[in-house]
């Protein structure tokens, strides 16, 4: 249940999240499967952990192999595992099967290309992008963030893509690249102003104080494909990533496309350990395309814990 | 309501085996951790067993190699297997909720079944 | 293991008179979280235990406010300001640091 296949190129750094999350205030400990033996914390090593993340600056494919981390949680020490497999660099220009990263599919009104893992990185824009191994060069082509546009798509703008980025650690850099098939879809779609499904205008959620809150932003967006889409969160009008407070988090759901054909998004906005404070703070759902923006403000206000189970009745 | 079940107790001779269910309503049994505790007449409460929610499972040296504790989560339901049982193992058994193992949220083991009672005798 | 220990064994109390419980752990009981996973559980006769205290000092749903948690690192004190008669029963401490262990029990009954 808590484990997870991940795969680099020596010579390049790879980064691993632990498959068994926990609070961030939590230690977690690696350890080398096979020999129990721990795993360093100290960044001088080529291999070390660092929370819930276990790096390989560089990798070698000697360090392929399953390792375990364990989170040191109450109650339980939690146990995931990471299956590692490091190989060796292509000396053409194929790219195997067991390297790529989940196909993606885009049309003429939606062409973004994601760079997969990138999040788990220290990475400055901008990525380079690479099709078939060639470098991608012309105007139809734009690096955005941790995504590759493509405009006008049209059939032969279908597969494979690397993207190319560089990883920083404390001053050193190390390369990465990750490859992606690209597929293209002949759709009949069409794009019109955001309509928010949740939440609602001005809802009222109820949250407990010290537990962990959830706020989903779910937008449609027509039929089809989107060109330019996007829902996010904002706190008091500021962006989540500018907001500075490390609890509060939004996650990217996954596209939807309903029974009826509506493209529709979601973003996830988790709060963990809900403070008093984040009850004074206004929670604005945006949804966003080429016809205009749409906002849903939602408030917080405490919930008093069920009283699953009265003692004295 | 918030609700543990436990069935499954009796008389069983030494050497033999036992399996206790534990039926739970009233809450997303998935995402609890969940335990089973035992009392020996006139004794204190000792930890059995337990389970998170991804199914992994622990014990004390007393149980561990013996008693095996599982969890079928579509069916809201806890089991404790008790294999070669000794008379040092008569005691009622309580199934309880642990922390939410999802959210990493403790309030303490709070939610008790009513007991069934394991008699291990010749 | 975590080993707890509870004093007194056995506590004869006046209804209306306060009443003090001591909980100590062999080794601190502070997680990185912030929290002390210490908890208090009430078994009245013929019942099953009754979730008190959680986490040192947060009273659970539907206890009255008598009852009071504190305490720190390896010592923690359960108190109730006036005994009731429905108070009578076998006190526990738990730890839920690591797996759980239960103390010995505090016997509490009416003189």
């Known amino acids: 249940k808590f484990s997870k296949q991940s795969w680099g190129l020596e010579n390049e750094a790879l980064i691993v999240r632990c498959p068994r999350q926990g609070k961030p205030s939590y230690t977690v400990d690696w350890y080398y499967s096979q020999t129990n033996k721990s795993i360093p914390t100290q960044e001088r090593n080529r291999v070390f952990a660092s929370g819930q993340l276990l790096k390989f600056l560089p990798a070698e494919v000697a360090d392929s192999g399953i390792y375990t981390c364990i989170v040191r949680s109450p109650t339980f020490n939690r146990t995931g595992y990471a299956n590692v497999t490091i190989y060796k660099k292509q000396s053409d220009c194929n790219v195997p099967d067991y390297l790529m990263y989940s196909t993606v599919s885009g049309s003429e009104k939606n062409s973004k290309i994601y760079c997969p893992t990138i999040d788990l990185y220290n990475w400055t824009a901008p990525l380079e992008w690479f099709k078939n191994c060639q470098a991608l060069q012309g105007s139809r082509y734009r690096a955005h963030k941790s995504f590759l546009v493509i405009d006008n798509v049209m059939t032969e703008d279908a597969g494979d893509y690397t993207c190319k980025f560089i990883h920083n650690e404390n001053g050193a850099n190390y390369s990465v690249t990750a490859t992606r098939s690209f597929t293209v879809k002949d759709e009949q779609g069409f794009s019109l102003f955001p309509v928010i499904g949740a939440p609602a205008q001005n809802e009222i959620k109820e949250v407990e104080i010290g537990k962990n809150a959830n706020l989903t932003c779910s937008a449609c967006f027509g039929k089809g494909t989107q060109f330019l889409a996007a829902v996010l969160w904002q706190l008091n009008g500021t962006k989540i990533t500018d907001f500075g407070e490390p609890r509060i988090q939004q996650e990217e759901g996954q596209n939807q496309s309903f029974s009826n054909g509506l493209a529709c998004l979601d973003m996830v906005l988790r709060i963990a350990d809900v403070k008093e404070e984040d009850l004074l703070l206004q929670y604005d759902c945006l949804a966003l395309n080429l016809h205009g923006l749409r906002r849903h403000t939602v408030r917080l206000s405490r919930k008093n814990p069920i009283d699953h189970h009265s003692i004295y009745c | 309501e918030v609700q543990l079940v436990e069935s499954g107790g009796g008389l069983v001779q030494p050497g033999g085996s036992l399996r206790l269910s534990c039926a739970a309503s009233g809450f997303t049994f998935s995402t609890y951790d969940m335990h089973w505790i035992r009392q020996a007449p006139g004794k204190n409460l000792e930890w059995v067993s337990a389970i998170d929610l991804a199914g992994d499972t622990y014990y004390p040296g007393s149980v561990k190699g013996r008693f095996t504790i599982s969890r079928e989560d579509a069916k809201n339901s806890l089991y404790l297997q008790m294999n070669s049982l000794r008379a040092g193992d008569t005691a009622v058994y309580y199934c309880?909720?642990?922390?939410?193992?999802?959210?990493?949220?403790?309030?303490?083991?709070?939610?008790w079944g009513q007991g069934t009672t394991v008699t291990v005798s010749s | 293991d975590i080993v707890m220990t509870q004093s007194p064994l056995s506590l004869p109390v006046t209804p209306g008179e306060p009443a003090s419980i001591s909980c100590r752990s062999s080794?601190?009981?502070?997680?990185?979280?912030?929290?002390?996973?210490l908890d208090w559980y009430l078994q009245k006769p013929g019942q099953s235990p009754q979730l008190l205290i959680y986490l040192g000092s947060n009273r659970a749903s539907g206890v009255p406010d008598r009852f009071t948690g504190s305490g720190s690192g390896t010592d923690f004190t359960l108190k109730i300001s006036r005994v009731e008669a429905e108070d009578v029963g076998v006190y526990y401490c738990?730890?839920?640091?690591?797996?759980?262990?239960f103390g010995g029990g505090t016997k509490v009954e009416i003189k």
């Open positions: 080794q601190s009981l502070l997680h990185s979280d912030g929290y002390h996973y």
């Open positions: 309880a909720r642990g922390g939410d193992g999802y959210n990493y949220d403790y309030y303490g083991i709070d939610v």
């Open positions: 738990m730890q839920a640091l690591q797996i759980l262990t």
